[in-house]
């Protein structure tokens, strides 16, 4: 049986999944798929990690936690009704039939008030949210030096999120300029 999680249209959905690495750095592959966990692997894979990195992801799907510490919780950005359904988190522990499988049912509710598209979504469309996967995407996705200057008077709604987000760290580390005012 699956456990039910809820989100509203336009929000980010959070699907928790964890494991305890046998030792620091002793990671196991993890896959996330749309649909219940099959006998092996994940069907319709939306994100995958290996022993070192996030090696596959699709747009809007990211890990906000630190998967190197065993936090492999999935965030789905800006959900729509079409995102409803069962998701599989599979911890691919070595050995025959050792995998840990979690079937999570995501229920999307219509937004109470349909929000106008925010500037923040404009921004994330231009710079995909994989930038906030806590720096654990493949190396080439972390080359942020080419980001343009960002004028936060034009993207004021982004300011609060930047304050406590990985993106702020990534932007700071990349040397991109954030102008306020």
């Amino acid at each position: 049986s699956e456990v039910e999680y809820r989100a509203e249209v336009g929000q980010n959905a959070y699907l928790p999944c964890f494991y305890t690495p046998a030792a620091p750095g002793n990671l196991v592959p993890v896959c996330w798929g749309k649909g219940a966990c099959p006998v092996f692997e994940c069907g319709n894979v939306v994100l995958r990690t290996d022993e070192r990195d996030v090696n596959y992801w699709t747009s809007r799907y990211w890990l906000n936690g630190d998967f190197r510490k065993g936090d492999v919780s999935l965030t789905i950005e800006n959900v729509t009704l079409a995102d409803s359904g069962i998701y599989c988190c599979r911890i691919q522990i070595p050995g025959i039939m050792n995998d840990e499988k979690f079937n999570l049912k995501l229920v999307i509710k219509p937004a109470k008030v349909t929000p106008a598209p925010t500037r923040q979504r404009d921004f994330t469309a231009a710079f995909p949210r994989m930038l906030t996967t806590r720096g654990h995407g493949p190396a080439e996705t972390q080359t942020l030096g080419s980001l343009p200057d960002i004028n936060l008077t034009q993207i004021s709604t982004l300011a609060n999120e930047l304050r406590d987000s990985r993106l702020a760290n990534d932007l700071r580390d990349s040397g991109a300029t954030i102008r306020i005012g």
Epitope: E4, T20, P24, D164, R166
Partner: antibody
């Protein structure tokens, strides 16, 4: 052997700030989330917040936003908790704990903090 | 925030008894629940994680069960050293939260 050694008891005046420390041995703090938990006398456990020492990212309980600041120094393998604008309500034992990743498998011995004039 | 409602708040039982402590989450936390024992004057110690997995060195008379929103901690054949306060904790999402605790006394 995994150990979390916390700094000693503190007696401070209202309005002051204090910084408590938690030094780890037997593991590298950058490999784990490090948390702080408050316990007032004869009361329950309250989660204050946590840090990812690998990059300094923090999370706080809303109640402790602005009151608590958690930092980590990976070179000394130490996590710290700073509490500001102290009042008698902050008198408590403060524990550091390691999570793995969603439960606390090791705890420090606790640091008693007394706020009194 | 996810509220963790733990009951009873106190419990008196006889040696050899089996006791049950319950914890109810205000929203689903799947199996991301742990149980801790805190003896008087001591630090909390992990008993159970992932709702039912026993931590290393914990006596087999302790067991946990449940998923979703309802969880139980069972202690069978109660021993004098089990006098303590027991807490549940959800580690699914921030802010982390604890139950209010159950103080166990021996009759």
């Amino acid at each position: 052997e995994v150990q979390l050694q916390q700094s000693g008891a503190e007696l401070v005046k209202p309005g002051a700030s204090v910084k408590l420390s938690c030094t780890a041995s037997g593991f590298n703090i950058k490999d784990y989330y490090m948390h702080w938990v408050k316990q007032r006398t004869e009361q329950g456990l309250e989660w204050i917040g946590r840090i990812d020492p690998e990059d300094g990212e923090t999370k706080y309980a809303p109640k402790f936003q602005g009151k608590a600041t958690i930092t980590a120094d990976t070179s000394s393998n130490t996590a710290s908790l700073q509490l500001s604008s102290l009042t008698s309500e902050d008198t408590a034992v403060y524990y550091c704990a390691r999570s793995n990743p969603y439960f606390f498998d090791y705890w420090g011995q606790g640091t008693p903090l007394t706020v009194s004039s | 925030d996810i509220q963790m409602n733990q009951s009873p708040s106190s419990l008196s039982a006889s040696l050899g008894d089996t006791i049950t402590i319950t914890c109810h989450a205000s929203q689903t936390i799947n199996v991301w629940l742990s149980w801790y024992q805190q003896k008087p004057g001591n630090i909390p110690k992990l008993l159970i994680y992932k709702a039912s997995k026993m931590h290393t060195g914990v006596p087999s008379r302790f067991s946990g069960s449940g998923s979703g929103t309802g969880f139980t901690l069972n202690i069978s054949s109660l021993q004098p050293e089990d006098i303590a306060t027991y807490y549940c904790h959800q580690g699914q999402s921030y802010p982390y939260t604890f139950g209010g605790g159950t103080k166990l006394e021996i009759k």
